[in-house]
Amino acid sequence: IWELKKDVYVVELDWYPDAPGEMVVLTCDTPEEDGITWTLDQSSEVLGSGKTLTIQVKEFGDAGQYTCHKGGEVLSHSLLLLHKKEDGIWSTDILKDQKEPKNKTFLRCEAKNYSGRFTCWWLTTISTDLTFSVKSSRGSSDPQGVTCGAATLSAERVRGDNKEYEYSVECQEDSACPAAEESLPIEVMVDAVHKLKYENYTSSFFIRDIIKPDPPKNLQLKPLKNSRQVEVSWEYPDTWSTPHSYFSLTFCVQVQGKSKREKKDRVFTDKTSATVICRKNASISVRAQDRYYSSSWSEWASVPCS
Amino acid sequence: RNLPVATPDPGMFPCLHHSQNLLRAVSNMLQKARQTLEFYPCTSEEIDHEDITKDKTSTVEACLPLELTKNESCLNSRETSFITNGSCLASRKTSFMMALCLSSIYEDLKMYQVEFKTMNAKLLMDPKRQIFLDQNMLAVIDELMQALNFNSETVPQKSSLEEPDFYKTKIKLCILLHAFRIRAVTIDRVMSYLNAS
């Protein structure tokens, strides 16, 4: 058993049928010695008396808010949560496996640049009695500071019969140098509590590996005289790290016909313009990627050919 | 990236082309190592990230773009000094910091070159003959060093009398390649920045 926060405790249980559970001793936070009784949640049934209460915690029915009283007055509370270990592996019931980029990916994180700011998000089908708390650091043995905000509900989607809820959090490394070569990964830890179930999820990454630039901005077409060709031009996104000559991007320009089956023409360039043939009803899209470290491509920025 | 790229003109800065070749070569070598050594811990998540140039060179600090010198988090240790007379210095206006930066890059390359050559000698003794260093990568390191053209003491190749532990050598190769790839990215960024300046 360990303390999650004041008066909230997590009991770790080896979870299998007929398991013996864990013996837990609760102590009433009071100078009083006599006439103390204990109850669980809203029940008025007295579970025991005295300054300490010994319980055998086996199932969720044994978890909850234990309260010690004296003469009708509440003295203190202890909330017990359960953390299930199933065959040596901590349970992951609360969050959905996003399966991207690989199986058992519960937390996904992205950064728009090298400033040390990043966003993480996760999915769940649970809509109520759910709380998250997020901590982060650079490295784990001698951790350096990363400050995270509160996790917020960022999207709701309907997936078949189920509703899916997306939560996200923004974090910022306290003293980040965009040019630094990372040798210690960022660690992100999310505590999730659903009713009386506690779970924790972690992700470990280098900022360089989670970079996904914003799409190029100010995408424009300039027709070339006496030609079906157009000059496409764009600019680096505002959110990208500067100077751009150091933090360079490479670009992919795509001409896509109206139907998805039509052949896509693609050109790759390090410049912020390209000459392409504009077909009728086609659209031109441009996306960006770090020129020197191949992390994710940005989403497409698009303009119609007409 | 295995995609057709319109290669930019190296312009006035002869080292840019060499640094791009270097990054391509080390990236290919790392990819080959990860595939060949699939039963070894060779992914970024599995290895310890060690920098053999730590406390010996300070390339990131010495080559920091002017725009980032206002960022206190970037100014850890900028007091390293190196020999200065590189042929990549495009004009006499080149600052002392730029010379310091390029000589730091040269020292990095020299250290990695020695490590890679020593490691290759060990790998050639492996009866499994599982993996060797790409000669192209070693050649590209050499070319960039020649382009930088710094006078520097030659570092003798380390020789080891004891029987090599091939498992450890292959893991060390992975560690080295990951670190060198990261340094090659920094070198490419620096060359691109200097070229634009």
Epitope: D14, W15, Y16, P17, E59, F60, G88, I89, D93 | -
Partner: antibody, heavy 115, light 112 residues
């Protein structure tokens, strides 16, 4: 004490269907994940499928994906395996088992797929 | 389709020490715990070892398990006639959990 009693096995022709049941008692069935494991005659153990305690997630071996469906009825304390498009290679003893460091197995039920 | 490799058979005379190996990889045994089962003919498997080296109550202490890196082993010190059975190791793969990964199985024969 924990008990898992299996039923539903038998002889069936290729391409036909069969449903296996596993009745649980002696524990809070709705709190635990459950597996199906099979063993072809003279062969080793092969995992077939898993279902979470609340039925929210199901996992299948590639060899049965799209043909077999694992399900549970927590009000009846029963686990099911619906097997469709049966093949000769599905012939095996099928076991249900609890998920956890200490597990409990059903007695096994024989499924024979033969024309 | 078996990722955990065991020797097909091992044998020993009563009182001898018999060991069975179970060889896997970094993503299974290297990252997860190992169990061992004993299966007597015509019966369901019986748990012998969980959590690499833990014995459930009721399992004789002549059975012991260990794990090192990407391999595990089961030792029977002082093998007895009633130990003649098939033995299976089991683990998980970090990418496909909760799918059970079973070893190929080992037939233990007690001679004499």
């Amino acid at each position: 004490q924990v008990q898992l009693v299996q039923s539903g096995g038998g002889v069936v022709q290729p391409g036909r269907s069969l449903r296996l049941s596993c009745a649980a008692s002696g524990f809070t069935f709705s709190s635990y994940g459950m597996h199906w494991v099979r063993q072809a005659p003279g062969k080793g153990l092969e995992w077939v499928a898993f279902i979470r305690y609340d039925g929210s997630n199901k996992y299948y071996a590639d060899s049965v994906k799209g043909r077999f469906t694992i399900s549970r009825d927590n009000s009846k304390n029963t686990l099911y395996l619906q097997m469709k498009s049966l093949r000769a290679e599905d012939t095996a003893v099928y076991y249900c088992k609890t998920h956890g460091s200490h597990d409990n197995w059903g007695q096994g039920t024989m499924v024979t797929v033969s024309s | 389709s078996y990722v955990l490799t065991q020797p097909p058979s091992v044998s020993g005379t009563p009182g001898q020490r018999v060991t069975i190996s179970c060889s896997g990889g970094r993503s299974n045994i290297g990252s997860n715990q190992v169990k061992w089962y004993q299966q007597l003919p015509g019966t369901a498997p019986k748990l012998l070892i969980y959590g690499n080296d833990q014995r459930p109550s009721g399992v004789p202490d002549r059975f012991s398990g260990s794990k090192s890196g990407t391999s595990a082993s089961l030792a029977i010190t002082g093998v007895q006639a009633e130990d003649e059975a098939d033995y299976y190791c089991q683990s998980y793969d970090r990418g496909t959990h909760p799918a059970l990964l079973f070893g190929t199985g080992t037939k233990v024969t007690v001679l004499g």
